[in-house]
Structures are given as structure tokens and as C-alpha cells.
Amino acid sequence: APTSSSTKKTQLQLEHLLLDLQMILNGINNYKNPKLTRMLTFKFYMPKKATELRHLQCLEEELKPLEEVLNLAQSKSFHLRDTKDLISNINVIVLELKGSETTLMCEYADETATIVEFLNRWITFCQSIISTLT
């Protein structure tokens, strides 16, 4: 059974992941630069089901495409503090949260998503899991 300390650690990691995802989304939305709309031509894959930490496998598999899109966006006057480090940090948190012992094959939904829809989906996931822990 999970201890209160492990639950607290999980909660903190989820909050960190949530903040990182929100920072990316804010970087896209708050910049108020319609030039960045070309990022919206990129296609992201969404999980069929995302209700447990192990489903973060689906986020992990999309981190490389996310990094590529953010790198491309940099040339359009969009500045995130070191995209590579940010994605790397997210990856570390995701690996710890989902657990490396579970080798879940991600099941993707038929519908794809834009970068904004993708980030919103995983932000909602984090918020949902955090609420069950508190």
C-alpha cells in the first residue's frame, strides 16, 4: 500500500509536471503571436484512456515530437528556457511517475490533436490525479 510519504512525493512530482506543461502552454498562448499558429499544423496522438499513472507512457512517447515542434517554434520569436532541458525534466518525472517496471503499450485514440489540445489533455490528467491524492 502506498505510504503517506510516497503519496506526497507522487503529488509533488505531478505538480511539477503540471507546472512544466502549463509553462509550455502559456508560452504558446500568452505570447499572443499569431505567427505561432503554424505550430498548429503538427499532429499529436492522444491516449484512448488516461486515468492512471501508468498511462503516462502515452505522454512519454510524444515527448520527442513535442520537443521538435518547440524547437521549430523558437525561430518564430517564441522563447522557452532551453527546450531540451525542459523536455528532459518532463521525461525524468514521467519515468518516475509511471514506473519503469510497467511496460504498457500505449493505446491511442483515433482522434489526433493540435499541440494546444494535447497539452490541455495532459494538464487535465495531472489535475485529475492530483485531486484524487489530496
Epitope: P34, K35, T37, R38, M39, L40, T41, F42, K43, P65, V69, L72, K76, T112, T114, V116, E117, N120
Partner: antibody, heavy 122, light 108 residues
Framework: EVQLVQSGAEVKKPGESLKISCKGS????????IGWVRQMPGKGLEWMGI????????TYSPSFQGQVTISADKSINTAYLQWSSLKASDTAMYYC???????????????WGQGTTVTVSS | SYELTQPPSVSVSPGQTARITCSGD??????AYWYQQKPGQAPMLVIY???ERPSGIPERFSGSSSGTTVTLTISGVQAEDEADYYC???????????FGGGTKLTVL
């Protein structure tokens, strides 16, 4: 009503210069990319390049880089396509088109001009 | 340079279903858009984001995507649907817009 209105048909001789226009109305012209598309007689659509009128940031198709110049004057909501020295092979219909977008979605080229016919012949 | 491949022509009888395909290596990661062009007219957007229909486009027009291929489907084809259809997307970097060669839809 959102629309793009292009300048009229042109007949030119090889070696002459030309500048055609595309005027936007009914929306914030500086906030949307405007692309130019060529269609040679009886052929398909070819993307030439795109401009962001807000700051004139421009991207050209590798096939058209150095062949044409795309520009914009945001004070009069107008984008331009120009040639410094026309060739017979530039004879075509040229369309301008707006790249549409919403808060989290890209609509593609959602508004098109009526097209400008350019004929280059000696 | 990046290319999108379409069949040059598709023929179908009125009331039947027409399917026009478009293939390209970047399509698993780049959305596709479809345009209809009738003789003497400017192209018109009929599908965006692989499968979404702009307002005013009849429900018989639909789009789908699978791997490196996207498909425009016109159900219950009508005589007025006879036109050239172009797919459009971007290269893998999202930098350059690319059109397919176009497909002439003939309604028999």
C-alpha cells in the same frame, strides 16, 4: 465579410517587371499569414511562399526562392508578388490565400483571392 | 523536396462514393487539408485538420487519415461535385506548404 481582392489581369513582355497585389478586408490583416499560389495553364496548384504582414516575415518555397519577391504594406492591408524580369514560363494564374486559425486549430487556406492572370509573351 | 501523391483521376457514377487518396511521408505528423476547384474558379477549402468540415460544406464530404495516407471521401456524389481536388499539407519541419498534384473527379 472576410475577403481578398486581387489586382487585374496583366499582359507583359519577357524581361519586363511586374507587381501584382492582394488586398484583405473584413479581418485583422496583420495577424494572418498570406500565401501565394501559382497555377500554370491546365496544371495543378504550386505553393510559392508566404508572408506575415505584421512584420513582413517571409518564407519562400525552394522552387521559387530568388525568382519572385513577396512583400506587404500593412498600412493599406495589401500583399504583393513581384518579378524583376518576367519569362514566358511565368504565364499563369496567381492566387493569394489566407492561412486561417482559431485558438487551438489551423484551418488551412480558408480564404482565397479571385486570382490574377499573368500572360508573358513577346 | 517533399511531395504529396494523388491519383490523376477518379471516376464515379452519381449517388456512388468517391474516394481520393493522398500520400506523403510527413502525414503521420502533419495535418492535411483538401480543396475543391471548379473550372474558372479559385480553390475552396472543403476539409481541414484531416477530417473537419468548414461551415457550408455539405456533409457528404468527409476526410480520414491513416499513417502516411489521407483520404477525401464524397458520399452520394452529385454532378456538381465534378471538379479538381487537391490535398495540401506541410513538410515534416512545418516550414513549407505543399500541394498534391490534384485529382480530377469525373461524375459519369
Amino acid at each position: 465579410e472576410v475577403q481578398l481582392v486581387q489586382s487585374g489581369a496583366e499582359v507583359k513582355k519577357p524581361g519586363e517587371s511586374l507587381k501584382i497585389s492582394c488586398k484583405g478586408s473584413g479581418y485583422s490583416f496583420t495577424s494572418y499569414w498570406i500565401g501565394w499560389v501559382r497555377q500554370m495553364p491546365g496544371k495543378g496548384l504550386e505553393w510559392m511562399g508566404i508572408i506575415y504582414p505584421g512584420d513582413s516575415d517571409t518564407t519562400y518555397s525552394p522552387s521559387f526562392q530568388g525568382q519572385v519577391t513577396i512583400s506587404a504594406d500593412k498600412s493599406i492591408n495589401t500583399a504583393y508578388l513581384q518579378w524583376s524580369s518576367l519569362k514566358a514560363s511565368d504565364t499563369a494564374m496567381y492566387y493569394c490565400a489566407r492561412e486561417g486559425f482559431g485558438e487551438s486549430i489551423h484551418y488551412g487556406l480558408d480564404v482565397w483571392g479571385q486570382g490574377t492572370t499573368v500572360t508573358v509573351s513577346s | 523536396s517533399y511531395e504529396l501523391t494523388q491519383p490523376p483521376s477518379v471516376s464515379v457514377s452519381p449517388g456512388q462514393t468517391a474516394r481520393i487518396t493522398c500520400s506523403g511521408d510527413a502525414l503521420p505528423r502533419q495535418y492535411a487539408y483538401w480543396y475543391q476547384q471548379k473550372p474558372g474558379q479559385a480553390p475552396m477549402l472543403v476539409i481541414y485538420k484531416d477530417s473537419e468540415r468548414p461551415s457550408g460544406i455539405p456533409e457528404r464530404f468527409s476526410g480520414s487519415s491513416s499513417g502516411t495516407t489521407v483520404t477525401l471521401t464524397i458520399s452520394g456524389v452529385q454532378a456538381e461535385d465534378e471538379a479538381d481536388y487537391y490535398c495540401q499539407s506541410a513538410d515534416s519541419s512545418g516550414t513549407y506548404v505543399v500541394f498534391g498534384g490534384g485529382t480530377k473527379l469525373t461524375v459519369l
